[in-house]
């Protein structure tokens, strides 16, 4: 068998909401993956498990099952969303994310993803992890790959 390549592209969008009383931030983060099948037979993307960390603390998890089948020598782009919560011992972040004196409230999140593929009863897992900048101050859509670099982060409204 030839390789199945998984490439984490980046954050596609981040939608934010707050609970003022609880000083809690809710971020729905949609990420994009490219999965390439270099084989001459189809492979099934059985599941994608993802988690997001902030300051070494897991703030969100997601799992997608029975996602798609990728044909021979084909590539598919897959979006997945991880709901995250920044609260409790990290509730000081509410002050940062709601500061009116700054335009872009970038925080650094560690995106971790594991893709499980199957073919002919054989299962394979591929994992990736990447630090990404996300604006916790407003709803943001990003050009693909943009969220990896702070100096180009001009969020599109």
């Amino acid at each position: 068998p030839r390789s199945i390549d998984v490439k984490y592209i980046g954050v596609k969008s981040a939608y934010v909401s707050y609970d003022v009383q609880k000083r809690t931030i809710y971020l729905n983060i949609t990420n994009t993956l490219n999965i390439t099948n270099n084989n001459y037979y189809s492979v099934e993307v059985e599941n994608i498990t993802a988690q997001v960390q902030f300051s070494k603390t897991v703030i969100g998890k997601a799992r997608l099952n029975n996602i798609t089948i990728i044909g021979p020598l084909d590539m598919k782009q897959i979006d997945y969303t991880v709901p995250t919560v920044i609260a409790e011992e990290m509730s000081y972040m509410y002050d940062f994310c709601t500061l009116i004196s700054i335009k872009v409230h970038n925080i650094v999140l560690m995106m971790q993803v594991t893709v499980t593929t199957t073919y002919f009863g054989h299962s394979e897992q591929i994992s990736q992890e990447r630090y990404q900048y996300v604006d916790c101050g407003r709803n943001t859509t990003y050009q693909l790959g943009q969220s990896e670099y702070l100096n180009v982060l001009q969020p599109q409204q």
């Epitope: 011992e89 000081y92 002050d95 970038n106 925080i107």
Partner: antibody, heavy 117, light 107 residues
Framework: QVQLQQSGAELVKPGASVKMSCKAS????????IEWMKQNHGKSLEWIGN????????KYNEKFKGKATLTVEKSSSTVYLELSRLTSDDSAVYYC??????????WGQGTSVTVSS | DIQMTQSPASLSVSVGETVTITCRAS??????LGWYHQKQGKSPQLLVF???NLADGVPSRFSGSGSGTQYSLKINSLQSEDFGTYYC?????????FGGGTKLEIK
Amino acid sequence: QVQLQQSGAELVKPGASVKMSCKASGYTFTTFPIEWMKQNHGKSLEWIGNFHPYNDDTKYNEKFKGKATLTVEKSSSTVYLELSRLTSDDSAVYYCARYFYGGMDYWGQGTSVTVSS
Amino acid sequence: DIQMTQSPASLSVSVGETVTITCRASENIYSSLGWYHQKQGKSPQLLVFAATNLADGVPSRFSGSGSGTQYSLKINSLQSEDFGTYYCQHLWSVPWTFGGGTKLEIK
């Protein structure tokens, strides 16, 4: 307004211990970690450790493990730094500060510790 | 531990001049960097947090920039109250460490 009030200067003998305080006011005490720094005269700053009143989580710089102990009195919103087995190397100004994302935004006025026989 | 290398160590400048202080981290600190100003006998004061954001009450002549391992603090049109020592500090992973400081003196 946010304030961190530190206890007064200390003159202590070698081998003894000293306990200094940092009283927080003007904000919800359990929300922000409190950091402690050491500054030798005319030198840069060294991070000793931090204490998060939300869950009593304490982190220390390896260099200060066994030397520094952080404790809390939540009823008075006060964090304490105790230094043990003092030597002349411990003579310095000790600062507490409030942690914020990407910086320490409020600082106490500092506590001067002089170790001398 | 992450090392913070700050330069220059000292600087002699006149009022009205522009100054840039740089800080290099031994590894990527993902913009988790603060800049502080300290006057003799006083506590440090936060100027810039998260590499680029001006703290409350800090004049707009101060600005922070950088990413990855390279960061800088720029002071436009220096005022007499700006003299003193400047420190950078990373807050990426404990132990937080400070740069060695830049002493700004009046020429």
